[in-house]
């Protein structure tokens, strides 16, 4: 089949990194600068991706493979192949239409990306709050109040590292 295809289509002999040049009697010509072909038999080369602005080059373009971008420090990739760069925020914040904003009271974000999420409601699981939540950390749920009744083995909660986060907007 390959042999038959080659006889029918001379372009099928052109390897990756070249294109079948119709202007030159279907000779295999190397891809011009800043372009590539990742498969054989191509009639054109694709333009290399350019990593500009907040995008930085992770892998240079070659004649056979496209450039790969990631994000400059302070940003992180979104989408397939890092098609977008989103600004980081600090822990305890989320990215809003007004930039990075502190999590509202009762919510937290322990990452530099994503949204503030509500603290766990310990009482829904019949438990009590062992360590208060902050803007950066979820609450820690402890034993249920019934488990702490007189006679039951008591748990001394560790002192919270800081006051509960409070950031009314």
């Amino acid at each position: 089949f390959e042999r038959t295809r080659s006889l029918q289509d001379p372009c099928s002999n052109c390897p990756a990194g070249t294109f079948c040049d119709n202007n030159r009697n279907q000779i295999c010509s190397p891809c011009p600068p800043n372009s590539f072909s990742s498969a054989g038999g191509q009639r054109t080369c694709d333009i290399c991706r350019q990593c500009k602005g907040v995008f930085r080059t992770r892998k240079e373009c070659s004649s056979t493979s496209n450039a790969e971008c990631d994000c400059t420090p302070g940003f992180h990739c979104l989408g397939a192949g890092c098609s977008m760069c989103e600004q980081d925020c600090k822990q305890g914040q989320e990215l809003t239409k007004k930039g990075c904003k502190d999590c509202c009271f009762g919510t937290f974000n322990d990452q530099k990306r994503g949204i503030c999420r509500p603290w766990t409601n310990c009482s829904l699981d019949g438990k009590s709050v062992l360590v208060n939540g902050t803007k950066e950390r979820d609450v820690v749920c402890g034993p249920s109040p019934a488990d702490l009744s007189p006679g039951a083995s008591s748990v001394t909660p560790p002192a919270p590292a800081r006051e509960p986060g409070h950031s009314p907007q």
């Epitope: 990593c51 602005g53 907040v54 977008m84 990215l95």
Partner: nanobody
Framework: EVQLVESGGGLIQPGGSLRLSCAAS????????MSWARQAPGKEFEWVSS???????YYVESVKGRFTISRDNAKNTLYLQMSSLRAEDTAVYYC????????????????WGQGTQVTVSS
């Protein structure tokens, strides 16, 4: 060919004012959302301000009330009026298209200028 060319940067004393311009060509400026970003020496890139084609504006908290983004569609030009400048505003300022329409988020297909240096120092 798309081009974004920033100008208007320079050395300015604290408390002073500057107006940055970004001349756009090669695309339909009037229907494009645009933004400014900056990078201070040794610091990370930071989104500064964005403007929709409608004229709606957004600013990072640290420049709110001091910087004003605007556009002149007849001149295909984006502006950043900067006043009450502080030492911490020292950076290279970049003009860019803003296809995501999401604050602090840029797409790989966005275009960027080469930047203009703003130095705030006495």
């Amino acid at each position: 060919e798309v081009q974004l060319v920033e100008s208007g940067g320079g050395l300015i004393q604290p408390g002073g004012s500057l107006r940055l311009s970004c001349a756009a060509s090669g695309f339909t400026f009037s229907s494009s959302a645009m933004s400014w970003a900056r990078q201070a020496p040794g610091k990370e890139f930071e989104w500064v301000s964005s403007i929709y084609s409608s004229g709606k504006t957004y600013y990072v908290e640290s420049v709110k009330g001091r910087f004003t983004i605007s556009r002149d569609n007849a001149k295909n030009t984006l502006y950043l009026q900067m006043s009450s400048l502080r030492a911490e505003d020292t950076a290279v300022y970049y003009c860019a298209t803003w296809k995501t329409l999401r604050v602090g988020v840029w797409d790989e297909s966005d275009y960027w200028g080469q930047g203009t240096q703003v130095t705030v120092s006495s």
